[in-house]
């Protein structure tokens, strides 16, 4: 069968869209350092990039490869309110490089990490 | 010590405008989300209006949306609040509220003496 | 009318401990923080109890507050003659994007 070029452009603009790689996400602040419920980040999210995106196979996972530290600036407030909004600077893993990963990959270099 | 210092209030037909400014000291103004808060003679408080600490967040109460305008100038340690198209149910003691995280904490720890705002003919 | 209900009036004796109560929705009290202010006859209000159960510095502890599911209370223990004022709670409503406060309570 012959498709037309509109098809075959619309399908491959969905596979790069969708394939693996650094993509700009909302991190909720607290969450991401498991603070206390009585610290609050104010703005509560920061903008960073983390690996995301679909792999061709069901046994691949999409992982970073290298990974980037950007220092941002947010006001602090804690509970009791002893002092006001504070700035602190907190450092954020920014995924630079992304590769498909078998889950066992994925299970070795998580290991290796904790190892080491 | 913090102080919020408002002024600005007066007599104004119905249909006028007016603006009143609470000024800021004793803290760090640009730190803290800011909130209008007004009370009519013998009734409760109504929140009015509020604005994050960027200027980049505005909120008002449904009774004066398309009305009234929040605004700051962080430079100038200043909240502002400019109303049109006034009305009689305007009339009431206005309250500039510091507040230290808008719609988490929920919570107004300083605030000002009040400015009388009368619309009448 | 208020988003928030309050009783108009309490009342009590030099002592006696009173509770003052709030009512709301899970758009407001169930799913936000609560705060109290004291209004004194002709003065601007006062915080008392912010995030449902924390004292500023300066507040007694003869005052309390709690919140349960769409519920916040206000508890005033061993009672004095310079509380007699309007007690009002405020919190945020996320479906109304702003804040509300009750009609407040007078206490005598």
């Known amino acids: 069968a012959h498709y037309n070029t509109e098809i075959l452009k619309s399908i491959d603009n969905e596979w790069r869209k969708t394939q693996c790689m650094p993509r700009e996400v909302c991190i909720d602040v607290g969450k991401e350092f498991g603070v206390a419920t009585n610290t609050f980040f104010k703005p509560p999210c920061v903008s960073v990039y983390r690996c995301g995106g679909c792999c061709n196979s069901e046994g691949l996972q999409c992982m970073n490869t290298s990974t980037s530290y950007l220092s941002k600036t947010l006001f602090e407030i804690t509970v009791p309110l002893s002092q006001g909004p504070k700035p602190v600077t907190i450092s954020f893993a920014n995924h630079t490089s992304c590769r498909c990963m078998s889950k066992l990959d994925v299970y070795r270099q998580v290991h290796s990490i904790i190892r080491r | 010590e913090v102080q919020l210092l408002e002024s600005g209030g007066g007599l104004v037909q119905p249909g006028g405008s007016l603006r009143l400014s609470c000024a800021a000291s004793?803290?760090?103004?640009?730190?803290?989300?800011m909130s209008w808060v007004r009370q009519a003679p013998g009734k409760g408080l109504e929140w009015v209006s509020a604005?994050?600490?960027?200027?980049?967040?505005?909120y008002y109460a449904d009774s004066v949306k398309g009305r009234f305008t929040i605004s700051r100038d962080n430079s100038k340690n200043t909240l502002y609040l400019q109303m049109n198209s006034l009305r009689a149910e305007d009339t009431a003691v206005y309250y500039c509220a510091r507040d230290p995280y808008l719609a988490r904490l929920n919570t107004f720890d300083y605030w000002g003496q009040g400015t009388l705002v009368t619309v009448s003919s | 009318q208020s988003v928030l209900t309050q009783p108009p009036s309490a009342s009590g004796t030099p002592g006696q401990r009173v509770t003052i109560s709030c009512s709301g929705s899970s758009s407001n009290i169930g799913s936000n923080n609560v705060s109290w202010y004291q209004q004194l006859p002709g003065t601007a209000p006062k915080l008392l109890i912010y995030y449902n159960s924390h004292r500023p510095s300066g507040v007694p502890d003869r005052f309390s507050g709690s919140k349960s599911g769409t519920s916040a209370s206000l508890a005033i223990s061993g009672l004095r003659s310079e509380d007699e004022a309007d007690y009002y709670c405020a919190t945020w409503d996320s479906s109304l994007n702003g804040y509300v406060f009750g009609g407040g309570t007078k206490l005598t």
């Open positions: 004793g803290f760090t103004f640009s730190s803290y989300d």
């Open positions: 604005i994050s600490y960027d200027n980049g967040s505005t």
